[in-house]
C-alpha cells in the first residue's frame, strides 16, 4: 500500500513524492534503502531531500533502488516506500512499456492528455507534445497548461503521446520527458475472449540474481473501447498484493495500445533486485473481459554463462 | 501534557443543529490532524472525519457526509463539529481526538448529545 | 469502502488466562490497522499502531499481529485492570472501526 513505483530517464529530472499521506509541515526523513543512509538536504547534492520529495538533478542508472521515507508527524511516524528505478536513453523512437504512464481515452468531444507527473515539477508552460517521437504541429493541437487538447479527434490520433519540459531548481535547468498512450473510443467496436500476445504459456525468461527485470503481460479484447478489459499479474495464484514484497510490483496504470486495430492492455511486473527466492515463484498474467478468462504462465531461470575457451 | 477540552452535554430538539467545540491545550491543533468520533450509548465507535486545521481541508465518512461539519480556528487552538438536523439517532458521545492522517492519539473526554422534545 | 469484522463481541476469561481477538477487513490492507482499548467512562486509548508497534507506555502483555485482511489482539497474562471493551481500527481506506469485543473477568 505504501510502496510506489516510480521511474525515470538517466540524465533527466525525477522527482518522487512519499507515499504516505500527510501535512507539508510535517518532517519527513528518506533513507536509501539497502545501506539504511539518510538522503541529505542540501540541495548542492545530485540527490537530495526536500520534504516530501526526493529529487534527482538529474537522475543515473546506478540511482535505482528502494528508498525509505519516515513522515514524523507529533504524534506518529509513518514508513513508506519509493521504488526507484532509472532508465537508460532509448536510442530509436520506440517507447518501452516499461515507461509508459496510465493510458487516456478521449472521443470527438473530450480530447484531454495530461501530461503524467507535472504537479510534482517546476515548470514553466509551454509544454511540447511528441506523437511518436513526431512533434505536434498543426492547430488541431493545443498544449494548455498541463495538458494537451486536439480539436476534432480521429481513430488515427490514437497513439504514444509524450510531454517534454524543463523543471528548473534553483536556476538550473533539467529536461524531463513522460510519454502515455491515448486511446479514441470507437462506437463501432466488439470484443473477443482474451488473447494473450506475451509472455506465450509456459515461457522460462533467464535473469540474472540481483539485477533488475521486468515481466509485460499483453492481452488484447477485440476492437474500440472495452466495457471490462484487464491484465494482472498473480504469484503462485495469489494477488500481487497479498504478495508482501515490496520489490516485486505491479505498475499502477494499465497501458492501453491498438494493434492492428485491436484494444490491447500491457501491465508490467517489475522485479527489483532478483533473488533465488523469485525463480521457485510461478508467475501468471491473466487477462479478463466479459467472455472469460485466459492465463499465461512464465517462469524466471538463472542466467547460464557460456564460457569459451 | 496534551489535553483536550470538551464541554461535558448538550439537550437539543429534534430538527434543530448544534455545535461542538474542542480546544486543545500544550498542543498547537494546525500541527496536526482533527478527528472526530462517534459513540452511541452501549454502542461501538463511529468516525465522522477528519480535517486538517492549518488548512481547513476535511474528509468525511460516507455516513456522515450531510450530518456533520468541521471546522477550526487556529487562532483559539479549537476545532468545531457541528451536527445538523437531529433525530434521536444522533444521540451519542461525540469524541475529538488528535492524530495524524492514518489514526488518533490524543483523545477528549467526549461531549454527550442528547435530541428529545 | 473497507469493512471490518471483529470477534468474538465478547468473552469472559479468568485472570492470568491468554484473550485473543481478530479482525478480518474485506480488502488487503497491508499492516495498517490499530488497537484501542476503552474502559468504561473514558475515552479509547490506542495500545498498538500500525505495523504491530506497541506505544509508549502501554505493557509488553498486549501485542498484535497480521498483514493483509487478518489481524490478531493478544492479551498474555490478563489482568483485571483489562476490563474494557477493544476495537480495531483500519485507516488504509477512510478509518473503520470494528464492532468492538468486551472484555470481562470470570
Known amino acids: 500500500k505504501f510502496s510506489k513505483q516510480s521511474w525515470g530517464l538517466e540524465n533527466e529530472a525525477l522527482i518522487v513524492r512519499c507515499p504516505r499521506q500527510g501535512k507539508s509541515s510535517y518532517i519527513v526523513d528518506w533513507y536509501y534503502s539497502q545501506t539504511n543512509k539518510s538522503i541529505p538536504t542540501q540541495e548542492r547534492n545530485r540527490v537530495f531531500a526536500s520534504g516530501q520529495l526526493l529529487k534527482f538533478l538529474p537522475a543515473e542508472v546506478a540511482d535505482s533502488g528502494i528508498y525509505t521515507c519516515i513522515v514524523r508527524s507529533p504524534t506518529f511516524n509513518r514508513t513508506g516506500y519509493a521504488n526507484v528505478t532509472i532508465y537508460k536513453k532509448q536510442p530509436d523512437c520506440n517507447v518501452p512499456d516499461y515507461l509508459m504512464y496510465s493510458t487516456v481515452s478521449g472521443s470527438e468531444k473530450n480530447s484531454k492528455i495530461y501530461c503524467p507527473t507535472i504537479d510534482l515539477y517546476n515548470w514553466t508552460a509551454p509544454l511540447e507534445w511528441f506523437k511518436n517521437c513526431q512533434a505536434l504541429q498543426g492547430s488541431r493541437y493545443k498544449a494548455h497548461k498541463s495538458f494537451l487538447v486536439i480539436d476534432n479527434v480521429m481513430t488515427d490520433d490514437a497513439g504514444d503521446y509524450t510531454c517534454k519540459f524543463i523543471h528548473n531548481e534553483n536556476g538550473a535547468n533539467y529536461s524531463v520527458t513522460a510519454t502515455r498512450s491515448f486511446t479514441v473510443k470507437d462506437e463501432q467496436g466488439f470484443s473477443l475472449f482474451p488473447v494473450i500476445r506475451a509472455p506465450a504459456h509456459n515461457e522460462t525468461k533467464e535473469v540474472e540474481i540481483g539485477e533488475n527485470t521486468n515481466l509485460t503481460c499483453s492481452a488484447c479484447f477485440g476492437k474500440g473501447a472495452q466495457f471490462l478489459a484487464t491484465v494482472q499479474w498473480q504469484l503462485n495464484g495469489n494477488k500481487i498484493t497479498d504478495f508482501s514484497e515490496p520489490r516485486i510490483q505491479q505498475e499502477e496504470g494499465q497501458n492501453q495500445s491498438f494493434s492492428n486495430g485491436l484494444a490491447c492492455v500491457n501491465t508490467v511486473l517489475r522485479i527489483a533486485d532478483v533473488k533465488e527466492e523469485d525463480l521457485l515463484l510461478r508467475y501468471d498474467c491473466l487477462a479478463l473481459n466479459l467472455h472469460g478468462l485466459r492465463r499465461h504462465t512464465i517462469r524466471l531461470s538463472r542466467k547460464h554463462h557460456h564460457h569459451h575457451h | 501534557e496534551v489535553q483536550l477540552q470538551q464541554s461535558v452535554a448538550e439537550l437539543v430538539r429534534p430538527g434543530a443543529s448544534v455545535k461542538l467545540s474542542c480546544t486543545a491545550s500544550a498542543f498547537n491543533i494546525k500541527d496536526d490532524y482533527m478527528h472526530w468520533v462517534k459513540q452511541r450509548p452501549e454502542q461501538g465507535l463511529e468516525w465522522i472525519g477528519r480535517i486538517d486545521p492549518a488548512i481547513g481541508n476535511t474528509e468525511y465518512a460516507p455516513k456522515f457526509q450531510d450530518k456533520a461539519t468541521m471546522t477550526a480556528d487556529t487562532s483559539s487552538n479549537t476545532a468545531y463539529l457541528q451536527l445538523s438536523s437531529l433525530t434521536s439517532e444522533d444521540t451519542a458521545v461525540y469524541y475529538c481526538?488528535?492524530?495524524?492522517?492514518?489514526?488518533?492519539?490524543?483523545w477528549g473526554q467526549g461531549t454527550s448529545v442528547t435530541v428529545s422534545s | 469502502e473497507t469493512t471490518v469484522t471483529q470477534s468474538p463481541a465478547s468473552l469472559s476469561v479468568a485472570t492470568g488466562e491468554k484473550v485473543t481477538i481478530r479482525c478480518i477487513t474485506n480488502?488487503?490492507?497491508?499492516?495498517?490497522i490499530h488497537w484501542y482499548q476503552q474502559k468504561p467512562g473514558e475515552p479509547p486509548k490506542l495500545l498498538i499502531s500500525e505495523g504491530n508497534t506497541l506505544r509508549p507506555g502501554v505493557p509488553s502483555r498486549f501485542s498484535s499481529s497480521g498483514y493483509g485482511t487478518d489481524f490478531v489482539f493478544t492479551i498474555e497474562n490478563t489482568l483485571s485492570e483489562d476490563v474494557a471493551d477493544y476495537y480495531c481500527l483500519q485507516s488504509d481506506n477512510m478509518l473503520t472501526f470494528g464492532a468492538g469485543t468486551k472484555l470481562e473477568l470470570k
Open positions: 480488502t488487503d490492507i497491508d499492516d495498517v
Open positions: 481526538a488528535l492524530g495524524d492522517f492514518y489514526a488518533m492519539d490524543y
